[in-house]
Interface confidence: medium
């Protein structure tokens, strides 16, 4: 059942479609209680009882995680894949998603990216787009499929609030971020605006309403002078490096 789906409450997830299937067909009414989708077993997880989030692809993990089998050789033999911590600079990698934000995989090593302000996933997305492989466009997710680069060239850039598949679908100053069980173009964050800090553990609510990343020259940090009894409810804002 959906209730048994484990949720890493920090990572932005591509949630399973309602009812666990491929999503409703156009015109159908999917009125499953929305809370079921994100009230998994570890919604109120603590550092002590952290449970890894099972995944099928990197997109399902947080910005500083990637999807892989926890033990070598298990993948492809029915082994469960989970979200693992990203690899830092100069660590070995097999693909871009394995490297931490601001890095990319070159010759099997995580190297610093020239575009360190880009969100993690932008590089992979451009590669996926060129291959015409929209593997993350799940039916029922509420956004159109595009399977060729050609169709992208003639596609009007999405405005704020417009449904998208990836950030390159959106106009300048916008990124493609989850909103409900879809993705829409949202503004890249400016200085002082609330941002989401993705950690491996802790945090309180699943971000089914994903924010964009902070703009160039900004980092998502805990708001100074924001003294909170509970760490989980502290606000993070985009601040100058």
């Amino acid at each position: 059942t959906l209730n048994s789906v484990l949720i890493n409450s920090n990572a932005i997830k591509n949630l399973p479609p309602p009812l666990g299937g491929a999503g409703g067909q156009p015109g159908s009414a999917v009125s499953v209680a929305p809370g079921v989708l994100y009230e998994g077993g570890n919604k109120y997880q603590t550092l002590d009882n952290y449970q890894p989030y099972p995944c099928a692809e990197d997109e399902e993990c947080g910005s500083d995680e990637y999807c892989s089998s926890p033990s070598r050789g298990a993948a492809g033999v029915g082994g469960v894949q989970i979200c693992l911590a990203c690899r830092k600079r100069r660590k070995r990698c097999m693909r871009h998603a394995m490297c931490c934000p601001g890095n990319y995989c070159k010759n099997g090593i995580c190297m610093p990216s020239d575009h360190s302000h880009f969100p993690r996933g932008e590089i992979e997305e451009s590669i996926i787009e060129n291959l015409g492989n929209d593997h993350n466009a799940a039916a029922g997710d509420g956004y159109p499929r595009r399977t060729t680069l050609t169709s992208k060239i003639y596609h009007t850039k999405g405005q704020e609030g417009s449904v998208c598949l990836r950030s390159s679908d959106c106009a300048a100053g916008l990124c493609c971020a989850r909103h409900f069980w879809s993705k829409i173009c949202k503004p890249v964050l400016k200085e002082g605006q609330v941002c989401t800090k993705h950690k491996r553990k802790g945090s309180h609510g699943l971000e089914i309403f994903q924010r964009c990343y902070c703009g160039e020259g900004l980092a998502c940090r805990i708001q100074k002078d924001h003294h909170q009894a509970s760490n989980s409810s502290r606000l993070h804002t985009c601040q100058r490096h």
Partner: antibody, heavy 116, light 112 residues
């Protein structure tokens, strides 16, 4: 500019049905989630339902689940709300709202009165 | 059911600053940093003033600002003007069956 115009409201008896429409213009209707929000006379706002851009997902408030159906026709740039088994407590101004970054654009509303 | 609690009324004089609070629970406002504020003048449709706690849509005056601490969000209006007199509603997302929750609304009166 973005424009949303509701229609179809009126007086209906308890147990009756009504279909509201919302004509959208000034934006790419087929690219946006849309919602219905209502406001009883002298009361606050209450979210009713939301539909995804391609109609594949619809969600409802508990108070209307099983009685109301949200739908859309992207070729006509129109959002609908079919309301069945109406009750006195459904009396309200019904607004259609574009659900972009939250409810970023609203129509002027249409009044639905359920009374015998 | 009103999920978020707001004061029924708030008042202030022109030029002053006022703050409207909105209190929820860890299942809604406290659990998500997604709070929006709407302004509604009598007989008119609501207008989005703040989203994502403290973001202003284009065209909204910078006199309007939002913040959040724990389970409580706040809307602050500085340099109060006569045209600010209206009803203000907070809105958040929630777990459970109701996806979108509103506050009961606060009537802002600008004195004088």
């Amino acid at each position: 500019q973005v424009q949303l115009v509701e229609s179809g409201g009126g007086l209906v008896q308890p147990g009756g049905s009504l279909r509201l429409s919302c004509a959208a213009s000034g934006f790419t209707f087929s690219s946006y989630w849309m919602s219905w929000v209502r406001q009883a006379p002298g009361k606050g706002l209450e979210w009713v339902s939301v539909i995804s851009s391609d109609s594949s997902s619809t969600y409802y408030a508990d108070s209307v689940k099983g009685r109301f159906t949200i739908s859309r026709d992207n070729s006509k740039n129109t959002l609908y709300l079919q309301m069945n088994s109406l009750r006195a407590e459904d009396t309200a101004v019904y607004y259609c709202a574009r659900h972009g970054i939250d409810f970023d654009h609203w129509g002027q509303g249409t009044l639905v009165t359920v009374s015998s | 059911d009103i999920a978020l609690t707001q004061p029924a009324s708030v008042s202030g004089s022109p030029g002053q600053s006022i703050t409207i609070s909105c209190t929820g629970t860890s299942s809604d406002l406290g659990g998500y940093n997604y709070v929006s504020w709407y302004q509604q003048h009598p007989g008119k449709a609501p207008k989005l003033m703040i989203y994502d706690v403290n973001n202003r849509p284009s065209g909204v005056s910078n006199r309007f600002s939002g913040s959040k601490s724990g389970n409580t969000a706040s809307l602050t209006i500085s340099g109060l003007q006569a045209e600010d007199e209206a009803d203000y509603y907070c809105q958040s997302y929630a777990s459970g069956n109701t996806k979108v929750v509103f506050g009961g609304g606060t009537k802002l009166t600008v004195l004088g």
